[in-house]
């Protein structure tokens, strides 16, 4: 796969994943539960990071936001933070990767700069994806630990306050947002890895400039074993003759047929 294709595909995959992370963060269906065991109406409860909703069999739906931060579980706050960090890093990653794309020319930006930006965006996407995956997994773990509520508590108070609180033993299931979050986090992570791989292809290979081969022409030969010049006394008569087979060649021959000693 070419560097441009790898980089472009990594960008698109990360973009899809990033969109999924935003969608998952905004969705209400992080946890779902059917509460059929009451005599008034069948109730379907679903909860997100920002509000809790109740849908009745009549179709009526009521959602209430988590307006207080103090009463919320620390784990929920942590999940919110992780998802927001993932989104913020994703936004930065997208902005950086747009400028890093090989198919987009911006000023006199060389491949070295684009390679660094590609690597940066790749790392940002990887961290963004990891944040989303951890956030969703923490929430899922929170649901698993709350699968069965079996204790009954007695709250007593003055003036008719209080009463018996019974926990209802029903199972909460993973909502659609969890699966969206896992897939989106995975895609963002994969896209980030692809960007990092593309970065390697964009980086100029320094070794190309370290090994230089020098080719000397036949006219600049400094040493010719076994040969002798006109100064030996043979004069022009011997100019185009071979002295012996396998011996030194004349100057005319040497210009068109360099020997193995012509390289210094």
């Amino acid at each position: 796969m070419s560097v441009t294709a790898c980089q472009g595909l990594g960008f698109v995959v990360s973009l899809i994943g990033f969109a999924g992370i935003i969608a998952a963060t905004c969705m209400d269906q992080w946890s779902t539960q059917d509460l059929y065991n009451n005599p008034v109406t069948a109730v379907f409860n679903y909860q997100g990071l920002w509000r809790s909703c109740v849908r009745e069999s009549s179709g009526f739906t009521e959602c209430r936001g988590y307006f207080t931060l103090l009463g919320l579980p620390a784990m929920l706050q942590a999940v919110r933070a992780l998802m927001i960090v993932g989104i913020v890093l994703g936004v930065i990653g997208i902005l950086v990767s747009i400028f890093a794309l090989k198919c987009i020319r911006i000023g006199s930006m060389d491949d070295s700069a684009k390679a660094k930006m590609t690597l940066t965006s790749g790392i940002l996407f990887i961290i963004s994806g990891i944040c989303a995956i951890i956030g969703v997994s923490v929430f899922a773990n929170m649901l698993v630990t709350n699968f069965w509520m079996s204790t009954a508590n007695m709250y007593s108070g003055m003036g008719g306050m209080g009463g018996m609180v019974q926990t209802v033993q029903t199972r909460y299931t993973f909502g659609a947002a969890l699966f969206v979050g896992w897939v989106a986090g995975g895609l963002t992570l994969i896209g980030g890895v692809m960007m990092c791989i593309a970065c390697r292809g964009l980086t100029p290979d320094d070794s190309n400039f370290k090994a230089v081969s020098y080719h000397a022409s036949g006219q600049n030969v400094a040493y010719r074993p076994g040969g002798f010049k006109a100064s030996t006394g043979f004069g022009s008569n011997t100019r185009n003759k071979k002295i012996y087979d396998g011996g030194a060649r004349t100057e005319d021959d040497e210009q068109s047929h360099p020997t193995k000693y012509d390289y210094v």
């Epitope: 946890s31 539960q33 509460l35 109740v54 009526f60 579980p73 709350n146 926990t167």
Partner: nanobody, 120 residues
């Protein structure tokens, strides 16, 4: 914690009226269903009336046409208007709410009960 405060019980003559109220307070997300149950001496607890957030209601057979349930969602309060009371309506009336109490958890909360006595 979720607390329920019931009020409105008392002594009333047959054919009279009473209005019970029950307010939920504490930390919770939603209260999908609020309702009233009653338990007469020596009898099992039975549904009087229930109401959902959307206004869906359900009444016990013995009170249909005489009792009316309503709720104020903003105040998390349920009301039971009891008209044409009969001696057989004498019982301890319990407020009952289904509370979405947190992420992945919900509670069925019962009040301590308020006594309604219908007598000459």
């Amino acid at each position: 914690q979720v607390q329920l405060q019931e009020s409105g019980g008392g002594l009333v003559q047959p054919g009279g009226s009473l209005r019970l109220s029950c307010a939920a307070s504490g930390t919770f997300f939603n209260i999908p269903v609020m309702g009233w149950y009653r338990q007469a001496p020596g009898k099992q607890r039975e549904l009087v009336a229930g109401i959902s957030t959307g206004g869906t209601t359900n009444y016990g057979d013995s009170v249909k046409g005489r009792f009316t349930i309503s709720r104020d969602n903003a105040k998390n309060t349920v009301y039971l208007q009891m008209n044409s009371l009969k001696p057989e309506d004498t019982a301890v009336y319990y407020c009952n709410v289904l509370v979405i109490s947190g992420i992945g958890s919900h509670l069925e909360v019962w009040g301590q009960g308020t006594l309604v006595t219908v007598s000459e």
